[in-house]
């Protein structure tokens, strides 16, 4: 049998930001899986603090319930059942309340 | 129609400054922004992305720290500062409007961007 490696990185990640201060989360798939399996995951952090850690078999994540006035890191990257792959990492802030006039 | 002109690339050493920017025309610039570029060689990438106030902003790994992305309403215009530039900076850097129908706030996502700039080159040497 032929032994599995890491994946590659998840590529094209894009965060969304909706009007209700939720995320949405997409990325493509790696080009090399080198494994048996496929799951996606996401890790939201503020600050050095995990907020959010989610796991999908499809790479398209809806982040709920964020807070104003925070820095927020994300990280999505893939596992091939034996292996995590390099994360790809973005970083949103929000500085301001959403009104209306902004929508 | 929203036309979008940059400015301010060239040949800069590496650690140094360069402040790019984005002008806007015929059109309203009531719209999410963002900044990409691209490497010979390689894909389009994310740089930084602003809404339409100014008060929330995303940025890739790769610049966090070191670009800073901000808008002038009153001017039309889009900046990017960038600080401590590396010889990977090195591209063609894009700027971008987002598309009316876009639902977003704020986006990474290119294909949520209908109007884009000619590019500026900027070059970093060691």
């Known amino acids: 049998t032929t032994k599995s490696a890491p994946p590659s990185q998840v590529w094209n990640m894009t965060v969304s930001m909706t009007s209700d201060n939720s995320m949405h989360v997409k990325c493509r798939p790696p080009r090399d899986r080198n494994g048996p399996h496929e799951r996606y995951h996401l890790e939201v952090e503020a600050g050095n603090t995990l907020v959010r850690n989610e796991s999908h078999k499809n790479c398209d994540f809806r982040v709920k319930d964020l807070q104003y006035s925070t820095d927020y890191t994300f990280k999505a990257y893939f596992h091939n059942g034996d292996y995590p792959g390099e994360p790809f990492i973005l970083h949103h802030s929000e500085q301001k309340l959403i009104s209306e006039e902004d929508l | 129609q929203v036309q979008l002109q940059e400015f301010g690339g060239g040949l800069v050493q590496a650690g140094a400054s360069l402040r790019l920017s984005c002008a806007a025309s015929g059109g309203t610039f009531s719209y999410f922004m963002g900044w990409f570029r691209q490497a010979p060689g390689k894909e389009r990438e994310f740089v930084a992305t602003i809404n339409r106030n100014g008060g929330a902003t995303g940025y890739a790994d790769s610049v966090k720290g070191r670009f800073t992305i901000s808008r002038d309403n009153a001017k039309n215009t889009l900046y990017l500062q960038m600080d401590s530039v590396t010889p990977e900076d090195t591209a063609v850097y894009y700027c971008?409007?987002?598309?009316?129908?876009?639902?977003?706030?704020?986006?990474?996502?290119?294909?949520?961007?209908?109007?884009w700039g000619q590019g500026t080159q900027v070059t970093v040497s060691s």
């Open positions: 971008a409007a987002a598309r009316e129908s876009s639902v977003y706030y704020t986006s990474t996502d290119p294909a949520e961007y209908g109007y």
